[in-house]
């Protein structure tokens, strides 16, 4: 058993079929010896009295908010809350996996630069009786300050017959150098708890590893005299590091047809302009990459072509 | 530390070339050694990330945009930097600033050119012959070097008496390319803002 | 998924007592509290007693005579029926909630609860 945060603890459960469970011991916060009984959330039935009570927890029943009461008056509570290891693995029924990069996958993070900002963003069918807290650390031996918000309900999805929710959390590192190379990972912990169950989530990175730009801003087109092509041109987006000829981004540049099924014209280019042929009905996407560590595309910058 | 005499090269075009040929080489190599060593540790994930130029080098620092140098989180990194008086920083000497900075990489080109050397000479000895250092990436280390143009005591391979451990080596040389990956992004995106400026 | 089965019924004279066993079986841990129902013959199924980790709750009609107990190591809920009249006559369900009531209450309700056993006969003649 471990503390979570005042009066809340976790109790770890090694779960299999025939498994003892675990013996707790509560201890009522007082000075006073005699007259406490205790009692577990809203029940008034008296569960037993002293000052300790001690209970075996084997099920999610057995968890809940104790409460030490004398003369009707309330002492202390302690929130016991159950994470749950079956077959040695601590159970993942709060989050869904999202299978993004790979299996096993909860968290997701992204950043759109280099000053140590990230998103990080997990998914749940469950609505209601949740609660999320984040921890970051640059390193776990010597961990270095990583301030995080608070995680907010971002958007909700209808996947089938179910609702899905999607929570993210910003964090910013606490001194962080654009230019520097990292070689100890950022850890980004979050804390669930639904109702009774307690189930923790880890991710580990590198901030260049998932970095994603934002699109390319000012995205216009120029026609070229007695010609079908049309000069492309954009911007470096605002929210990327500074200075650009340092923080370089290359670009690609595609033409669509109005049909998905048309073939895609590409170009790769590291300047902020293009020569391409516009066809009618078709339009022009950008997007953008950092020019020397391969992470991911920003999303499309589009404009029609005519 | 004795710092190499600089005679940097008056246009930085061929540094640039030669810097984006080095982050190419060093991707692929990466690459290589990720699919050919698959059952070994070899992903960003599973190994240690050293770097063989700490306390040696502070290419970062020296290197570091002007735009930055106003950022404290920059300027208090923990490696030591060669630019200890903070004035020089502020008035940006910059033709010594880019001397300093040059040469920085150029001490770095040479320690990962001495690494690899005397790795690829283990590597060569393993009966299983299964992975060996390309040897465009060992080239492009030299012409950048070159283009550099600094003069420096060359540095003898490291040789070793006793059996090598090829498994240890094979780790070693992902864990060494994965750190010259990150230094080779460094030098490019160096080499872009100095040829910009 | 949870498996509940029921054990322990059969023909008892008026005045007299039978002990139900109720074994659970399968993802026990997710139990949040357990009860017993009964259903007597063209009558509705109604709620007998709960029990959730050391409380317990009864219906008004069995209060005092019924005791619901628990056995943690075995995973097996009891009731203990004592001086049982003809009224008590039915088939007696166990049950098990999967989902979690703050009010212990909540757990007297039919639709708490998640998993059923086949249920056992319970005869009580005059």
């Known amino acids: 058993i471990w503390e979570l945060k005042k009066d809340v603890y976790v109790v770890e459960l090694d779960w299999y079929p025939d498994a003892p469970g675990e013996m707790v011991v509560l201890t009522c916060d007082t000075p006073e010896e005699d007259g406490i009984t205790w009692t577990l959330d809203q029940s008034s039935e008296v569960l037993g009295s002293g000052k300790t009570l001690t209970i075996q927890v084997k099920e999610f029943g057995d968890a809940g908010q104790y409460t030490c009461h004398k003369g009707g008056e309330v002492l202390s509570h302690s929130l016991l809350l159950l994470h749950k290891k079956e077959d040695g693995i601590w159970s993942t029924d709060i989050l869904k996996d999202q299978k993004e990069p790979k299996n096993k996958t909860f968290l997701r993070c992204e950043a759109k630069n280099y000053s140590g900002r990230f998103t990080c963003w997990w998914l749940t069918t469950i609505s209601t009786d949740l609660t999320f807290s984040v921890k970051s650390s640059r390193g776990s031996s010597d961990p270095q300050g990583v301030t995080c918000g608070a995680a907010t309900l971002s958007a909700e999805r209808v996947r089938g017959d179910n609702k899905e929710y999607e929570y993210s959390v910003e964090c910013q590192e606490d001194s962080a150098c654009p230019a520097a190379e990292e070689s100890l990972p950022i850890e980004v912990m979050v804390d669930a708890v639904h109702k009774l169950k307690y189930e923790n989530y880890t991710s580990s990175f590198f901030i260049r590893d998932i970095i994603k730009p934002d699109p390319p801003k000012n995205l216009q087109l120029k026609p070229l005299k007695n010609s079908r092509q049309v000069e492309v041109s954009w911007e470096y987006p605002d929210t990327w590091s500074t200075p650009h000829s340092y923080f370089s981004l290359t670009f690609c540049v595609q033409v669509q047809g109005k049909s998905k099924r048309e073939k895609k014209d590409r170009v790769f280019t590291d300047k902020t302009s293009a020569t391409v042929i516009c066809r009618k009905n078709a339009s022009i996407s950008v997007r953008a990459q950092d020019r020397y560590y391969s992470s991911s595309w920003s999303e499309w910058a589009s404009v029609p072509c005519s | 530390r004795n710092l190499p005499v600089a005679t940097p090269d008056p246009g930085m075009f061929p540094c640039l070339h030669h810097s984006q040929n080095l982050l190419r080489a060093v991707s692929n190599m990466l690459q290589k050694a990720r699919q050919t060593l698959e059952f070994y540790p070899c992903t960003s994930e599973e190994i240690d990330h050293e770097d063989i130029t700490k306390d040696k080098t502070s290419t970062v620092e020296a290197c570091l945009p002007l735009e930055l140098t106003k950022n404290e989180s920059c300027l208090n990194s923990r490696e030591t930097s060669f630019i200890t008086n903070g004035s020089c920083l502020a008035s940006r000497k910059t033709s010594f600033m880019m001397a300093l900075c040059l040469s920085s990489i150029y001490e770095d080109l040479k320690m990962y050119q001495v690494e690899f050397k005397t790795m690829n000479a283990k590597l060569l000895m393993d009966p299983k012959r299964q992975i060996f250092l390309d040897q465009n990436m060992l080239a492009v280390i030299d012409e950048l070097m070159q283009a550099l143009n600094f003069n420096s005591e060359t540095v003898p391979q490291k040789s070793s008496l006793e059996e090598p451990d090829f498994y240890k080596t094979k780790i070693k040389l992902c864990i060494l390319l994965h750190a010259f990956r990150i230094r080779a992004v460094t030098i490019d995106r160096v080499m872009s803002y100095l040829n910009a400026s | 998924e949870v498996q509940l089965v029921e054990s322990g019924g059969g023909l008892v004279q008026a005045g007299g007592s039978l002990r139900l066993s109720c074994a659970s079986s399968g993802r026990t841990f997710s139990i949040y509290a357990r009860g017993w129902f009964r259903q007597a013959p063209g009558k509705e199924r109604e709620f007998v007693a709960a029990?959730?980790?050391?409380?317990?709750t009864y219906s008004d009609s069995v209060k005092g005579r019924f005791t619901i107990s628990r056995d943690i190591a075995k995973n097996t809920v009891f009731l203990q029926m004592n001086s049982l009249k003809s009224e008590d006559t039915a088939v007696y369900y166990c049950a098990a909630a999967v989902n979690y009531f703050t009010d212990f209450t909540d757990y007297s309700k039919r639709d708490s609860y998640d998993y059923w056993g086949q249920g056992t006969q319970v005869t009580v003649s005059s």
């Open positions: 029990i959730r980790s050391g409380l317990t």
